[in-house]
Interface confidence: low
């Protein structure tokens, strides 16, 4: 007869490992007992369990509660055992020794490999600001055994670098994603992808990019200067900009205080019926935590009385 086993048994941390040992004998042969031991190189054998054909399973104190026989029905020639809740310390060489009648003793070895799935963590880098050079956007670290693979999934253009730290029974892999920040990256996902033989599927952690910026400011409302004449109602100036974080707006008048009746409503400056006192230089000041911008315009309120041609035009238009 001969023993059937596996060269390597691979199990994920916390799962049960089946250590196979089956005696394929001639008819009439019987298995008296099967002894399981751990036999790592350089260390003495450590007994796990003894399967006796008459007395059943005896588990050594060091493995009490952790070694069982597979559930019934059982073949009397099957000396396989289950090692419950495998931990990484269980990784190593195991030997089954089978005593048969009348053929004698047989032994076989297998290696137990315990996979430790990683638990990845993603750490965002420093605040991203438009105008910076190559900057760390995020780093992703995963520790496991064997070493996990850490990659990035994103539409954003950038560069990656990885490093690995070997611990006594695991390896930690850190990958960094660097980019040159631009406003177009705002809201874009940056996903760390961790692969490992102990995972049923890749683990993914997504970080949403936030890039601080402030666009140039401009003022709308003066496109047709002829509309800015005495008596006009509903005249307004609107300040245009965009930024991250969203900017706040402030209006001032360069050549004096804002005229009475002028309303400031965020990015909009609303005028009462126009008079010549509304002429002047108006400044829109845009700011966020990242930067500030100014845009100024000159308002020149026309007096139709001073230009008969214009007055005629206005009359004919009415």
């Amino acid at each position: 007869g001969e023993l059937e086993t596996s060269d390597v048994v691979t199990v994920v941390l916390g799962q049960d490992a089946k250590l196979p040992c089956f005696y394929r004998g001639d008819s009439g042969e019987q298995v008296g007992q099967v002894a399981w031991a751990r036999v790592d190189a350089g260390e003495g054998a450590q007994e796990l369990a003894l399967l006796h054909s008459k007395y059943g399973l005896h588990v050594s104190p060091a493995y009490e509660g952790r070694v069982e026989q597979p559930p019934p029905p059982r073949n009397p020639l099957d000396g396989s055992v289950l090692l419950r809740n495998a931990v990484q310390a269980d990784e190593g060489e195991y030997e089954c020794r089978v005593s048969t009648f009348p053929a004698g003793s047989f032994q076989a070895r297998l290696r137990l490999r315990v996979l430790v799935p990683p638990l990845p963590s993603l750490n965002p880098g420093p605040a991203l600001e438009e105008g910076q050079g190559l900057t760390l956007a995020a780093s992703c670290t995963a520790e496991g055994s064997p070493a996990p693979s850490v990659t990035w999934d994103t539409e954003v253009k950038g560069t990656t670098s990885s490093r690995s730290f070997k611990h006594s029974r695991s390896a930690a892999v850190t990958s960094e994603f660097h980019l040159v920040p631009s406003r177009s990256m705002n809201g874009q996902p940056l996903t760390c992808v961790v692969s490992h033989p102990g995972l049923l599927q890749d683990q993914r952690i997504t970080h949403i990019l936030h890039v601080s910026f402030l666009a140039e400011a401009s003022v709308r409302g003066l496109e047709d200067q002829n509309l800015w004449h005495i008596g006009r109602e509903g005249a307004m100036l609107k300040c245009l900009s965009e930024g991250q974080p969203p900017p706040s707006y402030n209006w001032t008048r360069l050549d004096g205080p804002l005229p009475s009746g002028v309303r400031v409503d965020g990015d909009t400056l609303g005028f009462p019926p126009l008079t010549t006192e509304h002429s002047g230089i108006y400044v829109c000041h845009v700011s966020n935590e990242f930067s500030s911008r100014d845009s100024q315009v000159t308002v020149d309120v026309l007096d139709p009385q001073e230009d008969s041609g214009k007055q005629v035009d206005l009359v004919s238009a009415s």
Epitope: N85, V87, A89, L119, F165, S168
Partner: antibody
């Protein structure tokens, strides 16, 4: 019997330095990773640092990184913690602890010293 | 870092009571959890490792359970010497982190 005995604590001014020692006996010091854990007065436990058997890898809590250095001398069965640029918030009882490596790649702490008090005050 | 949250932060109980302390991890930590007991002025003592394994020499009235994010320490029949502070600790990732502690006091 496993024994861990810390020494080197005391009163030090902010910005000062101290070196803690932990003498191990009763087991094979070279086969276990070691940690320092601290406990501020009336507060909970905070892990500080770890060193592996052959000193190849050291880990630190963010709160002490760049200021504290863990080391070991396997020939003397001794663990050390060099503490520089000490702050008032470093005031605590500092324990050395043995890590139970034979269980998994993560480590619990199966033996602890009695602790040594470090007080940072002007 | 993984946050460990214990509840309750303190409890009052009588000798013979069954006491349960819970510990929740901010993310899954498999069974990489230990429980420690600390008495005033003393060093912590390991009670339970791997979430449910009893450390050698610890009385069998202490037991642990749970996996993933939710864990429990149970004292089946509280004894006078069990009045102490209990801490959970994850050691799945670096840095290892402790719960804030649960103080068990005499009612």
């Amino acid at each position: 019997e496993v024994q861990l005995v810390e020494s080197g604590g005391g009163l030090v001014q902010p910005g000062g330095s101290l070196r803690l020692s932990c003498a191990a006996s009763g087991y094979n010091f070279t086969t276990s990773a070691m940690s320092w854990v601290r406990q501020a007065p009336g507060k909970g436990l905070e892990w500080v640092s770890r060193i592996y058997q052959d000193s190849s890898t050291t880990d630190y809590a963010d709160s002490v990184k760049g200021r504290f250095t863990i080391s070991r001398d396997n020939s003397k069965n001794t663990l050390y913690l060099q503490m520089n640029s000490l702050r008032a918030e470093d005031t605590a009882v500092y324990y050395c602890a043995r890590q139970t490596e034979d269980r998994s790649y993560g480590y619990d702490l199966d033996y602890w010293g009695q602790g040594t008090l470090v007080t940072v005050s002007s | 870092d993984i946050q460990m949250t214990q509840s309750p932060s303190s409890l009052s109980a009588s000798v013979g009571d069954r006491v349960t302390i819970t510990c929740r991890a901010s993310q899954g930590i498999s069974s990489y959890l230990a429980w420690y007991q600390q008495k005033p002025g003393k060093a912590p003592k390991l009670l339970i490792y791997a979430a449910s394994s009893l450390q050698s020499g610890v009385p069998s009235r202490f037991s642990g359970s749970g996996s993933g994010t939710d864990f429990t320490l149970t004292i089946s029949s509280l004894q006078p010497e069990d009045f102490a502070t209990y801490y959970c600790q994850q050691h799945y990732t670096t840095p290892p982190t402790f719960g804030q502690g649960t103080k068990v006091e005499i009612k």
